[in-house]
């Protein structure tokens, strides 16, 4: 077993020790005090002075060094001889041991190097991992951006194609519009031609009407003459009858004729004791002319003369001025009593007007005017109303002040349009106003958003067409 060790003795000299079996060899290398003394002014690692040493000192120092060198050289030579003479075998072993030791040192150094290399490698791996992470993250971001860019590019492409489609569509529509314009021009031309033809036709009709009017005047004159003749004949007959009426039975029959009861309105009918609702014959004031009217003997004490009723759409209310003047329809159903009769009646005494309304949802409402009358035909049967009460709106749906009556052939409204033609039916149109109870009759589920229906604006608005309406009058003092 051999071992080689390097250490220091108690005074700090270097010593080399070789262990061989049970023998141990120690080599002490000589050192001079001058060399070792830290207090010596000549220590090699002392701070260099600014001023140079004295020459004699230098020479002395060199001499000392030379002698030490000489001693050392001699000592080394002796040692060398000793080793060569006495320790050739051990030398081999020592060399082997030295090689082993150096190998161990080398291995240790190698191990250290390996450890350091491993540490560096680990650090590098860490850095590499970080770089990889960063790279991966960047790659992902790049991928995302790439995808986003692709998506945007696709969207742009889609939009571009959409724009192209729209442009194509636009071009097509433009072409269509141009075609339509051409068609319209042609149509306008044909309409103009039709209009010219119609004007010619109207002119012809006007001349025919004028001729008919002339004939009517002639007929009226003839009629008047005939009426006069008839009147004269009646009087003659009456005189003759009076002269020859000698029997009591004849006298009694004439008396009965003179005492026949006539009713001016339904209030008169009610007062006479006839209190059942139904159709009664009424006589025009100051005249023998008669008309049939429906008397409502139940509502609010009875005695109401019905002047208008809508309930099922069975009667056409788009009528002429003359028809509205004399009346039309069936008094027990849908009808208009007649403007002339109502005008004459309401100018005799003060009347109230009650308008009863029903919607399609089963609701009922009414408007009551405490004073109502119509002007004569000379003033287009203008309506006059005062004192509104009731549940069908606090504002009158018949425009105030009252308007003239208009029909499809008599435009007396305040609109540049012709309300009666546009909204249908005869009414006291303003321009065109908030009501028209003589409008088109619309059935249920078709009765909304109708501008030409049966309208009472302040109860149901402008587009609601009512289910049923009744207009009735009664003397204010009933």
């Amino acid at each position: 077993y051999s071992n080689f060790r390097k250490s220091m003795d108690s005074v700090g000299r270097k010593q080399y020790q070789v262990q061989h079996g049970s023998c141990s060899y120690t080599f002490l290398l000589p050192e001079t005090d001058n060399c070792r003394s830290s207090s010596s002014p000549y220590v090699s690692n002392a701070v260099q002075r600014d001023a140079p040493l004295d020459y004699d000192d230098s020479v002395h120092r060199l001499q000392v060094l030379e002698s030490i060198m000489e001693n050392n050289t001699q000592w080394l030579m002796k040692l060398e001889n000793y080793i060569q003479d006495n320790m050739k075998k051990e030398m081999v072993e020592i060399q082997q041991n030295a090689v082993q030791n150096q190998t161990a040192v080398m291995i240790e150094i190698g191990t250290n190097l390996l450890n350091q290399t491993a540490e560096q490698t680990r650090k590098l791996t860490d850095v590499e991992a970080q770089v990889l992470n960063q790279t991966t993250r960047l790659e992902l971001q790049l991928l995302e951006h790439s995808l986003s860019t692709n998506k945007l590019e696709k969207q742009i492409l889609d939009q571009t194609s959409e724009i192209n489609k729209l442009q194509d569509k636009n071009s097509f529509l433009e072409k269509k519009v141009l075609d339509m314009e051409d068609k319209h021009i042609v149509q306008l031309q044909s309409i103009k031609e039709e209009k010219d033809q119609l004007q010619v036709l109207v002119s012809k009709q006007n001349s025919i009407i004028e001729e008919l009017e002339r004939q009517l005047v002639t007929a009226t004159v003839n009629n008047s003459a005939l009426q006069k003749q008839q009147h004269d004949l009646t009087e003659t007959v009456h005189s003759l009858l009076t002269m020859i009426a000698t029997s009591s039975s004849a006298k009694n029959s004439f008396a009965a004729k003179e005492e026949q009861i006539t009713f001016r309105d339904c209030a008169d009918v009610f007062r006479s004791g006839l209190t059942t609702s139904g159709i009664y014959t009424l006589t025009f004031p100051n005249s023998t002319e008669e008309t049939k009217a429906y008397c409502d003997m139940e509502t609010g004490g009875g005695g109401w003369t019905t002047i208008q009723r809508r309930e099922d759409g069975s009667v056409d209310f788009q009528r002429t001025w003359k028809e509205y003047k004399v009346g039309f329809g069936n008094p027990s159903g849908e009808h208009w009593l007649g403007n002339e009769f109502v005008s004459q009646l309401t100018n005799q005494q003060r009347y109230v007007l009650k308008i009863h309304l029903r919607d399609w949802e089963g609701n009922e409402a009414y408007s009551l005017y405490e004073h109502f009358y119509l002007s004569s035909e000379e003033f287009n049967y203008r309506i006059h109303l005062k004192g509104l009460t009731g549940t069908a709106g606090k504002i009158s749906s018949i425009s105030q002040p009252g308007n003239d009556f208009s029909t499809k052939d008599a435009d007396n409204d305040k609109c540049i349009c012709k309300c009666s033609q546009m909204l249908t039916g005869g009414w006291w149109f303003d321009a065109c106003g908030p009501s028209n109870l003589n409008g088109m009759y619309y059935p249920q589920r078709q009765n909304t958003n109708k501008f030409n229906g049966i309208k009472w604006y302040y109860w149901k608005g402008s587009g609601y067409s009512l289910k049923a309406t009744t207009m009735m009058i009664r003397p204010a003092d009933f």
């Epitope: 504002i395 106003g433 958003n449 302040y458 402008s462």
Partner: nanobody
Framework: QVQLVESGGGLVQPGGSLRLSCAAS????????MHWVRQAPGKGLVWVSR????????SYADSVKGRFTISRDNAKNTLYLQMNSLRAEDTAVYYC?????????????WGQGTLVTVSS
């Protein structure tokens, strides 16, 4: 000339309240039925509510019934819409409109609208 000017719109949180006003001029306000109509972003016009001329009768769309209240002050020529318990779906431009006598239930004059945004 007839003019209708809405105001009172703005941003409000769900469950919040707003009161819209519509100032009318150029016509006899007390003689006309008035309506509120709204238009959600990208959608069509939807009727919201109406009030008759004297304020005695009102009507509402099912979607706002119980939450919105229409009213009017004829002395001030102003129409109102009180909106409570607002929802995100109430976000829209709100218009007031006049129902003409002969408009067949349609509107002959409109305001310029006021935007109501319901968002948290």
């Amino acid at each position: 000339q007839v003019q209708l000017v809405e105001s009172g719109g703005g941003l409000v949180q769900p469950g919040g309240s707003l009161r819209l006003s519509c100032a009318a001029s150029g016509f006899t306000f007390s003689s006309y039925w008035m309506h509120w109509v709204r238009q959600a972003p990208g959608k069509g016009l939807v009727w919201v509510s109406r009030i008759n001329s004297d304020g005695s009768s009102t009507s509402y769309a099912d979607s706002v019934k119980g939450r919105f209240t229409i009213s009017r002050d004829n002395a001030k020529n102003t129409l109102y819409l009180q909106m409570n318990s607002l929802r995100a779906e109430d976000t829209a431009v709100y218009y007031c409109a006049r129902e003409g006598y002969s408009s067949g239930g349609q509107f002959d004059y409109w305001g310029q609208g006021t935007l109501v945004t319901v968002s948290s």
